[in-house]
Interface confidence: medium
């Protein structure tokens, strides 16, 4: 029989032959034979994998390093990851949470409507038509666009809510 | 190495202005939001104010709004208070401070004192 060129869900593709992928949490020994099925173990502790897998090594659960205000939300097994979250009153400084900051900053777009306090975190608010942000900031609010016609120009470019307006020179008409 | 220097304090009357200033130095004074605080005699530190990184934005604690106003220099790297209608409860060592995202203030300076007084 001609040998396959593509194999069913949960298969791949080796030595012209269709081998059946290592189940999630476990790592690949072996590739399978015309005789032998493929050869799997499971991954050892602190080790995951989280898909149907042609892989030799298993992942490394993600550390939560309590130097960086992290802490264990949810522990790992042998099909997830560690999932990491911050300290009491810290913050995620993304959504994988790597590290914690102790007040949250507002991304470029958005601004500060309230800054943080002992209590509360940073309060952030996306900038209204007019108003742009072009950092990422504990403090900063959003800021105006500039008024190109105070200063008798005309706009350029139209401003967004990460971007300040772009004013030029008018065009005069010539004689 | 990060510095702070506070300079511009002194006795003054009640009523009566000054300006206090903080040369900084060792860090990207241009991208860091930077506060004043302040410790009268025998208390704890107290929040006065916050400057934004582009001065744009700047907050106020409820006890001086209204008399006080922080601004920056950024080609001088500077920070400055204007301090005015001056109380004696306005009596204080003055300390300006450093935005880390990580730990929130950090870096002061040695402080400039402040005394109001007739």
């Known amino acids: 029989p001609e040998p396959p060129t593509a194999c069913r869900e949960k298969q791949y593709l080796i030595n012209s032959q269709c081998c059946s992928l290592c189940q999630p949490g476990q790592k690949l020994v072996s590739d399978c034979t015309e005789f032998t099925e493929t050869e799997c173990l499971p991954c050892g502790e602190s080790e995951f994998l989280d898909t149907w897998n042609r892989e030799t090594h298993c992942h490394q659960h993600k550390y939560c390093d309590p130097n960086l205000g992290l802490r264990v939300q949810q522990k790992g097994t042998s099909e997830t990851d560690t999932i990491c979250t911050c300290e009491e009153g810290w913050h995620c400084t993304s959504e994988a949470c790597e590290s914690c900051v102790l007040h949250r900053s507002c991304s470029p777009g958005f601004g500060v409507k309230q800054i943080a306090t002992g209590v509360s975190d940073t309060i952030c608010e996306p900038c209204p038509v007019g108003f742009f942000s072009n950092v990422s900031s504990a403090f900063e609010k959003c800021h105006p666009w500039t008024s190109c016609e105070t200063k008798d120009l005309v706009v350029q470019q139209a401003g967004t809510n990460k971007t300040d307006v772009v004013c030029g020179p008018q065009d005069r008409l010539r004689a | 190495e990060v510095q702070l220097l506070e300079s511009g304090g002194g006795l003054v009357q009640p009523g009566g202005s000054l300006r206090l200033s903080c040369a900084a130095s060792?860090?990207?004074?241009?991208?860091?939001?930077m506060e004043w605080a302040r410790q009268a005699p025998g208390k704890g530190l107290e929040w006065v104010s916050t400057?934004?990184?582009?001065?744009?934005?700047?907050y106020y604690a409820d006890s001086v709004k209204g008399r006080f106003t922080i601004s920056r220099d950024n080609s001088k790297n500077t920070l400055y208070l204007q301090m005015n209608s001056l109380r004696a409860e306005d009596t204080a060592v003055y300390y300006c401070?450093?935005?880390?995202?990580?730990?929130?203030?950090?870096?002061w300076g040695q402080g400039t004192l402040v005394t109001v007084s007739s």
């Open positions: 400057i934004s990184e582009s001065g744009y934005s700047t």
């Open positions: 401070a450093k935005w880390n995202s990580t730990t929130g203030f950090d870096y």
């Open positions: 060792g860090f990207t004074f241009s991208a860091t939001p």
